[in-house]
């Protein structure tokens, strides 16, 4: 960056190199060039010369003043016009940053995705800080009082093998940057209560054209958890509102769920599960699309209807690399 240049003087920022966005700041430049009493001192921001709010303080120093500085990052440097020099002489440069102190982290959530071997902790960091902000996740055993700390820039994955202090823990998050530090409320967790079952996946769908067409959705999960509650939501792609069906599920076999849907309409399905009675849900599965067939013309003959049923005309959809849904309401 600009800070690596060879300096023939000094550049500094008041109140600091990293400051709160919207502040008034002063940038000072002091030349220390051999055989040079500068006739002029110039400031550049991101390579563009500044023309206003420059004050010459003394023979070697000048000040550039900014009101309400709102840029997250800027590269500043200053130059001197030295007598007998036809080109400006570089004095020094500095990268400056503006931003905000961190908000108090809230909505701290820790879950264990089945088979992951990790406890994943996330939180709402609040408003964008614009500057480098680090988070320390504190995990304290309620049984042994032992505390572990994990440094991260966003979320954290903690190996469950490292959680040796029993099943009950307190978790809290400290956020810190150059402008301040905040700490979340403490979250009490029990490792057995935060497991999210292995992802439920819709594998295929078929519509059987009978007297009343019926769509069967096939879905499964590799979970070993015995008591699992699931929700399947579906809607016509043209609709805004979802219909939701609830299931108590045993995943020892592939699940089949029946729906009576309108003909010749494209539907979208998603499923999610949780360990029954626990707090956290899986994120909704990938979007699964299925278009129902057009209605078979109704004929009064029962036999014909029966034959139509026996003909077993089906329309099937299978799952292949679906679009990922938005994850609103993923956990909790």
């Amino acid at each position: 960056g600009i800070t690596n240049i060879n300096c023939s003087g000094h550049i500094w920022v008041e109140p600091a190199t990293i400051f709160k966005m919207g502040m008034n700041i002063s940038i000072y430049c002091q030349a220390a060039i051999k055989n040079c009493q500068p006739r002029k001192l110039h400031f550049y921001k991101n390579g563009i010369k500044e023309r206003f709010q420059i004050t010459r303080i003394n023979k070697t120093t000048a000040r550039l003043w900014y009101k309400n500085f709102l840029e997250p990052h800027a590269s500043m440097y200053c130059t001197a016009e030295c007598p007998k020099h036809f080109q400006e002489t570089l004095i020094c440069g500095k990268d400056i940053s503006s931003g905000y102190p961190p908000d108090i982290p809230d909505e701290v959530t820790c879950v264990i995705y089945e088979y992951s071997g990790n406890m994943t902790c996330t939180w709402n960091a609040g408003k964008l800080t614009y500057i480098d902000t680090k988070y320390v996740v504190h995990v304290k055993s309620l049984e042994t009082e032992e505390e572990q700390q994990y440094l991260t820039s966003s979320y954290i994955n903690i190996s469950t093998d490292s959680l040796q202090g029993g099943k009950k823990y307190l978790v809290w998050v400290q956020a810190a940057n150059a402008l301040g530090m905040e700490e979340s409320k403490q979250l009490q967790i029990h490792l057995d209560d935060i497991v999210i079952p292995s992802a439920a996946v819709i594998s295929r769908a078929e519509t059987i054209n009978a007297t009343v067409p019926k769509t069967i959705i096939y879905w499964d999960s590799q979970t070993t958890i015995e008591k699992v509650s699931c929700e399947m939501r579906y809607k016509a792609t043209t609709n805004q509102t979802w219909n939701v069906k609830e299931f108590d599920t045993n995943f020892t076999y592939v699940q089949q769920s029946e729906f009576y849907l309108e003909p010749n309409i494209k539907y979208v399905f998603q499923v999610r599960c949780q360990e029954t009675g626990k707090r956290y849900w899986q994120p909704w599965s990938s979007l699964f699309f299925h278009k129902t067939p057009e209605t078979v013309p109704q004929v009064t003959s029962k036999a014909f209807q029966h034959d139509t049923w026996n003909s077993g005309l089906t329309v099937a959809s299978i799952s292949t690399g679906h679009l990922t849904s938005d994850n609103r309401g993923d956990i909790g």
Epitope: R39, Y44, K49, R51, E81, H85, F86, Q87, E88
Partner: antibody, heavy 118, light 115 residues
Framework: QVSLKESGPGMLQPSQTLSLTCSFS??????????VGWIRQPSGKGLEWLAH???????YYNPALKSRLTISKDTSKNQVFLKIANVDTADTATYYC??????????WGQGTTLIVSS | QLVLTQSSSASFSLGASAKLTCTLS???????IEWYQQQPLKAPKYVME???????STGDGIPDRFSGSSFGADRYLSISNIQPEDEAIYIC?????????????FGGGTKVTVL
């Protein structure tokens, strides 16, 4: 009002020494950041910087001609001098002096022509 | 090596706008240059200085039809509403101290004809 005027011999033979004088008014060569330079231009060709001298007697020469050039000044008379030793036909040109303020040759004399011929 | 490159000639209709280019050698692309005007059989005249950010300051008696700008290693002299008296050779110049030696170089000049 700034003005500069060059004077010289007009004609020289090869191997002679050229002596040029720049007489100026409207500024002083004792003023901080002030200088006077010499530039020449062969007929129909481009400009070539030769030398310049600053208020504090600091002198700069074109590296390609340095061994033949001498610049000096007399601040009391508002004059700057340039000597070019061992002239050759390639030195035939119009010679200009110009005021140097900061980094700009901002005022020029009308020029004096030199012909080197045997 | 410090070099300035200019096209040798350019023609413009009376009252039109002209834009002349002076290109610095690539390793000197941040340098400030000067523009000079040399009318036929006259001494050069200082027009303006153009810095790397396009800022410029004109010499005494230069009409405000003349302006300067910059892009990369190119320095421009623009003349709006060009007049017969603007017919001249326009020369750019640049100075620098390189390896303890000072050098001032001129471009070859662009001859401007007003039609």
């Amino acid at each position: 009002q700034v003005s500069l005027k060059e004077s010289g011999p007009g004609m020289l033979q090869p191997s002679q020494t050229l002596s040029l004088t720049c007489s100026f008014s409207g500024f002083s060569l004792t003023t901080f950041d002030m200088g006077v330079g010499w530039i020449r231009q062969p007929s129909g060709k481009g400009l070539e910087w030769l030398a310049h001298i600053w208020w504090d007697d600091d002198k700069y020469y074109n590296p390609a001609l340095k061994s033949r050039l001498t610049i000096s000044k007399d601040t009391s008379k508002n004059q700057v001098f340039l000597k070019i030793a061992n002239v050759d036909t390639a030195d035939t040109a119009t010679y200009y002096c110009a005021r140097l303020q900061g980094s700009d040759f901002d005022y020029w004399g009308q020029g004096t022509t030199l012909i080197v011929s045997s | 090596q410090l070099v300035l490159t200019q096209s040798s000639s350019a023609s413009f209709s009376l009252g039109a706008s002209a834009k002349l280019t002076c290109t610095l050698s690539s390793q000197h692309s941040t340098y400030t240059i000067e523009w000079y005007q040399q009318q036929p059989l006259k001494a050069p005249k200082y027009v303006m200085e153009v810095k790397k950010d396009g800022s410029h300051s004109t010499g005494d008696g230069i009409p405000d039809r003349f302006s300067g700008s910059s892009f990369g290693a190119d320095r421009y002299l623009s003349i709006s509403n060009i007049q017969p008296e603007d017919e001249a050779i326009y020369i750019c110049g640049v100075g620098d101290t390189i390896k303890e030696q000072f050098l001032y170089v001129f471009g070859g000049g662009t001859k401007v004809t007003v039609l």
